[in-house]
Amino acid sequence: GITIPRNPGCPNSEDKNFPRTVMVNLNIHNRNTNTNPKRSSDYYNRSTSPWNLHRNEDPERYPSVIWEAKCRHLGCINADGNVDYHMNSVPIQQEILVLRREPPHCPNSFRLEKILVSVGCTCVTPIVHHVA
Amino acid sequence: GITIPRNPGCPNSEDKNFPRTVMVNLNIHNRNTNTNPKRSSDYYNRSTSPWNLHRNEDPERYPSVIWEAKCRHLGCINADGNVDYHMNSVPIQQEILVLRREPPHCPNSFRLEKILVSVGCTCVTPIVHHVA
């Protein structure tokens, strides 16, 4: 791994191993200032594997609202605008980190949690298992 | 919003507003214990808008390694296996939360940061601007 020299101005902590509990500043720094959110906002409709976005809300989680994609069709839209069932629309999934209130209902104490979210859909050739 | 009764067992903190700095347990709870990672691992090759995965490493960030998708073609793969430039391969992007060491090089002090990552690619009908 990469060894980083420790900054002498770090907050004190007993960190015998990699710290189990750390301090986190929730003032989010957004690195995406130049991105145009409208750019990808219509892909869900224009894709050959279009998807619907479903709101998933959990007040015990930060962020409390996550949008989940579900593919609109089993197949993919062909050049004629019809669904082609020789192909499959499948969700593209990603593991993301969220903060889970722990103990529950505590405003200032969290635990990192990994969840799997579907971000959008893509069109793939199906795996067909041929029988001898 | 949803009001959650505060748990009396919460750690003490001065929380005049929504806390700026909170305690976070880094022992990650993985909600995806049943998921089979092999399932989606080959979509990047089987998609009509295939992509390559690029490793993005930053020791000052947690997680330090993030995989970024880059679409392999401008167009999409058609039924004959050729690239069709009447369609576009585009990245599906998602804003995710990461932890950024702050001050730098500190092992136990972080700030939440939002970054935009490309998770995979989808095939879309291009937007054509007609000239009068």
Partner: antibody, heavy 118, light 108 residues
């Protein structure tokens, strides 16, 4: 009014063949997704096969290579050709129409019983 | 192959709320449907695409699907709701339809 009526079931010996029919009315079979689902006596539902509106077909692993789904557009009828029948194929066979999206089945026939026994 | 899990039986008193769960690996990324089957009858679709109710199905039937679990909720359960209930999804990995083993709902 949408109706589906299966026929062709009966007693058949192991290794034998049978053809089930499903006569549809109130809609066009060829422009819909049509499926066969079976239910062994006292057991749950098991999907068998589907033919999508574009003619693409899929089968459950348990019947692949033995069963063939087809449709006759002129008769507005769905078929299931069952070959090399086994005792474990004994069940009530339902014909079902898939919803537009294809994710579920919105209309079901009354079923026809197939008994495979020597 | 993809599998769905349901409790074999659920009991509820008339007028109370019955909840029937259906679990599957990352089921929330797929659409879940629910069917009601009474003895000697064909299945009837009661919920499709997680939470949509076909016309003719009473408003007391509702559905949700998130994470690894889909839930069918029957509020103000009536004696006529006593039946077997099956959840179902389409597995995009195998291009196959999958049914749960079924749950027998008893109205006490």
């Amino acid at each position: 009014q949408v109706t589906l009526k299966e026929s062709g079931g009966g007693l058949i010996q192991p290794g034998g063949s049978l053809r089930l029919s499903c006569a549809a009315s109130g809609f066009t079979v060829s422009s819909n997704h049509m499926s066969w689902v079976r239910q062994a006596p006292g057991k749950g539902l098991e999907w068998v096969s589907i033919i999508y509106s574009d003619g693409t077909t899929y089968y459950a692993d348990s019947v692949k290579g033995r069963f063939t789904i087809s449709r006759d557009n002129s008769k507005n009828t769905l078929y299931l050709q069952m070959n090399s029948l086994r005792a474990e194929d004994t069940a009530v066979y339902y014909c079902a129409r898939g919803r537009n999206s294809g994710f579920s089945f919105d209309y079901w026939g009354q079923g026809t019983l197939v008994t495979v026994s020597s | 192959s993809y599998e769905l899990t349901q409790p074999p039986s659920v009991s509820v008193s008339p007028g109370q709320t019955a909840s029937i769960t259906c679990s599957g690996d990352d089921l929330g990324s797929k659409y879940a449907s629910w069917y009601q089957q009474k003895p000697g009858q064909s299945p009837v679709l009661v919920i499709y695409q997680d939470d949509q109710r076909p016309s003719g199905i009473p408003e007391r039937f509702s559905g949700s699907n998130s994470g690894n679990t889909a839930t069918l909720t029957i509020s103000g359960t009536q004696a006529m709701d006593e039946a077997d209930y099956y959840c179902q999804t389409w597995d995009y990995w195998t291009s196959k339809y999958v049914f749960g083993p079924g749950t027998k709902l008893t109205v006490l």
